[in-house]
């Protein structure tokens, strides 16, 4: 049997239980991309909270990441326009497709700085703190990373959770 | 293999700062922020605030605001906090540990802690 | 800034007892709480992330639960490596807090 038939058929197996997973629209195929050299050391890269995503330790400790990667990995291909059959599903890239998974990682990384921005205040840039010393002078940032990451989102303690975050949006008093 | 390493104990004089540092290896430095603990017998552990390594962005406890300077240096992979205008009060066991990372949500609890560094303020 | 507080500094065990540490904070921080275990001399360690979340590599006797304000740290039959200090602390907003730790320790 093909290659590619073996791994149609192993995906056909799980889609149906892996569903909710691909919900998140390819972030954390992009973050598995950014974090491959680093061991996976979650049981499941999502968010717990979320029903039928993540595992409690009510469940089995058994990982099936490599399952989920490879599914999650074909929804996004697919959502991102590579197909299954194109010759990028089998490794090869050329500039388009490097410069795309560059863009997906921004996006990825812009998000999760707003993100902590909004939770615990994390400010976008070091300009913000007057007292952050020269070890991180403007030379060593990238330049057009103040633009790319847009207006500094200071979180108040009174501020709402993102809409996306699947804690309760309870105000905070303390 | 995941690593922080941090520099040495440090015995400083009242009044003067300190720099301590974290050297991480094994994973992209860029990609998970960076926090320090303070540890006291007294007060037990208190968070002191969070570096973007990739941005320099930071995020302080108020109450460590203008004692704690957070830094980062992405061509070393090392992040650094300078503490100043020490008292007995910073007397402690300094850690530097990454935050634990997800998919779509991110949380800041901490996956990987160094051995940490203890700074003793005595004239 | 939101309180954890461990009711109880010390605990008294024995190895194989099942024993629970609670932590409780001072407003809702729905299921953003997190545990670890500090031997003498070592940095600590995580356990349990989210409420409920047992850590890559972490044993199964190890669990947590609860949300909102109440949470429970349960180790189902202790084992002489399990005597040690255990820290919740709430990742649901900055200041980042912990609680003030529970020993464990044998009878």
């Known amino acids: 049997m093909k290659r590619k038939e073996r791994i149609a058929r192993r995906l056909e197996g799980i889609e149906t239980d892996t569903q909710p997973i691909l919900l998140q629209s390819c972030t954390g195929l992009v973050t598995h991309r950014l974090l491959e050299e680093d061991t996976p050391r979650y049981m499941r890269a999502t968010d717990p909270a979320s029903p039928h995503i993540g595992r409690s330790n009510e469940e089995e400790e058994t990982s099936d990441s490599s399952l989920e990667k490879q599914t999650r990995s074909k929804q996004c291909t697919e959502t991102s326009g590579i197909h299954a059959d194109s010759p990028y599903s089998s490794g090869i890239m050329d500039t388009q497709s490097l410069e795309s998974k560059a863009e997906r990682i921004a996006r990825y990384k812009a998000e999760r700085r707003r993100q902590l921005a909004e939770k615990y205040g994390l400010t976008l840039d070091p300009e913000a703190d007057s007292e952050t010393p020269s070890r991180y002078s403007r030379s060593r940032k990238d330049p057009e990373a103040a633009e790319k990451r847009g207006v500094r989102s200071e979180r108040s303690a009174e501020s709402s959770r993102d809409a996306g975050s699947s804690y309760s949006r309870t105000e905070l008093s303390g | 293999q995941v690593q922080l390493q941090q520099s040495g104990a440090e015995l400083v004089r009242p009044g003067a700062s300190v720099t301590l540092s974290c050297k991480a290896s094994?994973?992209?430095?860029?990609?998970?922020?960076m926090h320090w603990v303070k540890q006291t017998p007294v007060h037990g552990l208190e968070w002191i605030g969070a570096i973007d390594p990739e941005t320099g962005g930071t995020a302080y406890n108020q109450k460590f605001k203008g004692k704690a300077i957070l830094t980062a240096d992405k061509s070393s992979s090392t992040a650094y906090m300078e503490l100043r205008s020490l008292t007995s009060e910073d007397s402690a066991v300094y850690y530097c540990?990454?935050?634990?990372?997800?998919?779509?949500?991110?949380?800041?609890?901490?996956?990987?802690w160094d051995t940490g560094t203890t700074v003793t303020v005595s004239s | 800034d939101i309180v954890m507080t461990q009711s109880h500094k010390f605990m008294s065990t024995s190895v194989g007892d099942r024993v629970s540490i609670t932590c409780k904070a001072s407003?809702?921080?729905?299921?953003?709480v997190a545990w670890y275990r500090q031997k003498p001399g070592q940095s600590p360690k995580l356990l349990i992330y989210?409420?409920?979340y047992r850590y890559t590599g972490v044993p199964d006797r190890f669990t947590g639960s609860g949300s909102g304000t109440d949470f429970t740290f349960t180790i189902s039959s202790v084992q002489a490596e399990d005597l040690a200090v255990y820290y919740c602390?709430?990742?649901?907003?900055?200041?980042?807090?912990f609680g003030a730790g529970t020993k464990l320790e044998l009878k």
């Open positions: 989210s409420a409920s």
């Open positions: 540990t990454r935050s634990g990372i997800y998919d779509g949500n991110y949380w800041w609890y901490f996956d990987v």
């Open positions: 094994g994973y992209t430095f860029t990609d998970y922020e």
């Open positions: 602390q709430q990742h649901y907003s900055a200041p980042l807090t």
């Open positions: 407003q809702d921080v729905s299921t953003a």
